[in-house]
């Protein structure tokens, strides 16, 4: 996988009036490493690993750059015409990548009310607009505003990409994304019984890198895909990842099932606890992982945040 640096910014408007401030977070190699504190108006480390490795200068620089980007995004939102009443959002995702062959990529993507309306390649300055008439109108609105804005030149896009790559290289050198291996902690639980069946869930947590195989086996043989339910592999905020797999089995057949895990050349099988050792979860056995808001405003205002 290529090394990547990604910034996610969002500004909001209420009844046509653009709100002050903005929301932002940063990801390094898919891991959250930066969050923007809206109250203190500062970029802060996300997770102990970022805090330990990146110095104060990083957060000063990031604060300056994010403030500038946030202001740009707010100005862009003011130029989006026909904003109906209520709450609206404009989101920008900016990504730069360094691939194994040392080639680079850079792009940014804009979403209005959670809907993608413009993608730009920062290296070629090519733009892509989805087919929908709403996206076409929004893209035209925004690009027309940028044409009037002297800052939005090709030189500016190149500088944007160069700046992103420079940061990515600096962060990689400082060892934030050292390719260490952290083996997963695996734990198997059983949910309540219904109609003679139980749901067994196998959770792998605190592992790095993110590539993992997690599957249920019956008598040593992998169950078919359609009998298993997988969760996404998600960052857990500590520079490591978590995921799960679940399946339904007949009560009394626990001994036949094991959760098989393979990660970075290591593997293990984990049996279903049975009899007195059976771990019963509470009724809440839903496995949906919600994107936790960067800030309470997300939850309160139910804004869709694109990862």
């Amino acid at each position: 996988e290529p090394h990547s640096l990604r910034y996610n910014l969002m500004v909001l408007s209420q009844d046509g009036s653009v709100q002050s401030g903005f929301l932002a977070e940063g990801h390094l190699d898919g891991q959250p490493f930066l969050r923007y504190d809206r109250q203190k108006r500062r970029a802060k480390p996300q997770g102990q690993w970022a805090e330990d490795v990146l110095g104060a200068k990083t957060w000063d620089t990031e604060t300056e750059d994010l403030t500038e980007n946030g202001q740009d995004l707010r100005r862009t939102l003011t130029h989006i015409k026909d904003q109906k009443g209520g709450l609206h959002s404009l989101q920008e995702i900016r990504v730069c990548e360094i691939h194994e062959d040392s080639s680079t990529r850079g792009s940014r993507h804009f979403y209005y009310d959670g809907e993608l309306f413009l993608s730009q390649n920062l290296e070629t300055q090519e733009s892509t607009v989805p087919q929908s008439s709403r996206a076409q109108t929004l893209a035209m609105n925004v690009t027309n505003f940028w044409k009037e804005d002297a800052m939005k030149t090709k030189t500016h896009y190149r500088a944007m990409q160069a700046d992103c790559l420079q940061k990515l290289q600096r962060y990689l050198k400082s060892g934030v994304a050292i390719r260490r291996t952290v083996p997963p902690m695996v734990n198997v639980t059983c949910s309540e019984v219904s109609e003679g069946n139980i749901t067994v869930t196998c959770r792998a947590s605190s592992f790095y890198p993110r590539n993992i195989t997690l599957t249920w086996r019956q008598d040593g043989v992998s169950l078919s895909h359609n009998t298993q339910q997988w969760g996404d592999v998600l960052p857990d905020g500590n520079g490591t990842y978590q995921t799960w797999v679940a399946t339904r089995i007949r009560q009394g057949e626990e001994q036949r099932f094991t959760c098989y895990m393979e990660h970075s050349g290591n593997h293990g099988t984990h049996p279903v606890p049975s009899g007195k050792a059976l771990v019963l979860q509470s009724q809440r056995t839903d496995h949906h992982h919600h994107h936790h808001g960067l800030n309470d405003i997300f939850e309160a205002q139910k804004i869709e945040w694109h990862e």
Partner: antibody
Framework: EVQLQQSGPELVKPGASVKVSCKAS????????IYWVKQSHGKSLEWIGY????????VQNQKFKGKATLTVDKSSSTAYMHLNSLTSEDSAVYYC???????????WGQGTLVTVSS | DIQMTQTTSSLSASLGDRVTISCRAS??????LNWYQQKPDGTVKLLIY???RLHSGVPSRFSGSGSGTDYSLTISNLEQEDIATYFC?????????FGSGTKLEIK
């Protein structure tokens, strides 16, 4: 190439015990179960049980509980089946087998003939 | 325990023939049916798993079919090297059980 090499033939007296070995090679031993199967002379096959080499967990056919004990030695990638209190009924060829994770008894050992006779 | 019945204990056929060996389970085994070949020297090989999936390296002249309680193994073009005893086995319910075997001979 996956290979299961079993120990040689055994001639044992009634009441004695025997330990059949199955040395695995060509794959990561702790990844896949080892299964044991019995074939009495001129008869069909009977599943005895299996062991998960990673954690030593076993699942057995009730019929063979108390008769067969399954163990592994991870350091030598070898599975063992210990048969006790032998009688003429235990005279048979015993096979070990393993899986590729997709099918049962995917690869088989060559079999070990155990003869119980006074 | 689930009983696996192979009614034909031995079968004679000529080289090039299409041969079908059947196997019946005493209850529905939901396609968890495997076929094994045992050569006269005792060597055992997996041929087909999950009713119809051909194990890697097994010639395509072997095929399997069936559902519920009735299953079959077909050899489309019998060759000399196919002379062996064929066993079916269910993997649906413990204990795993095998059929009594069908010995295939050349006419």
């Amino acid at each position: 190439e996956v290979q299961l090499q079993q120990s040689g033939p055994e001639l044992v007296k009634p009441g004695a015990s025997v330990k059949v070995s199955c040395k695995a090679s060509g794959y990561a031993f702790t990844k896949y179960n080892i299964y044991w199967v019995k074939q009495s002379h001129g008869k069909s096959l009977e599943w005895i049980g299996y062991i998960d080499p990673y954690n030593g967990g076993t699942v057995q056919n009730q019929k063979f509980k108390g008769k067969a004990t399954l163990t592994v030695d991870k350091s030598s990638s070898t599975a063992y089946m210990h048969l006790n209190s032998l009688t003429s009924e235990d005279s048979a060829v015993y096979y070990c087998a393993t899986t590729d994770g997709y099918s049962l008894f995917t690869y088989w050992g060559q079999g070990t003939l155990v003869t119980v006779s006074s | 325990d689930i009983q696996m019945t192979q009614t034909t204990s031995s079968l004679s056929a000529s080289l090039g023939d299409r041969v079908t060996i059947s196997c019946r389970a005493s209850q529905d085994i939901g396609n968890y049916l495997n076929w094994y070949q045992q050569k006269p020297d005792g060597t055992v090989k997996l041929l087909i798993y999950y009713t119809s999936r051909l194990h890697s390296g097994v010639p395509s002249r072997f095929s399997g079919s069936g559902s519920g309680t009735d299953y079959s193994l077909t050899i489309s073009n019998l060759e000399q090297e196919d002379i062996a005893t064929y066993f079916c086995q269910q993997g649906n319910t413990l204990p795993f059980t095998f059929g009594s075997g069908t010995k295939l001979e050349i006419k």
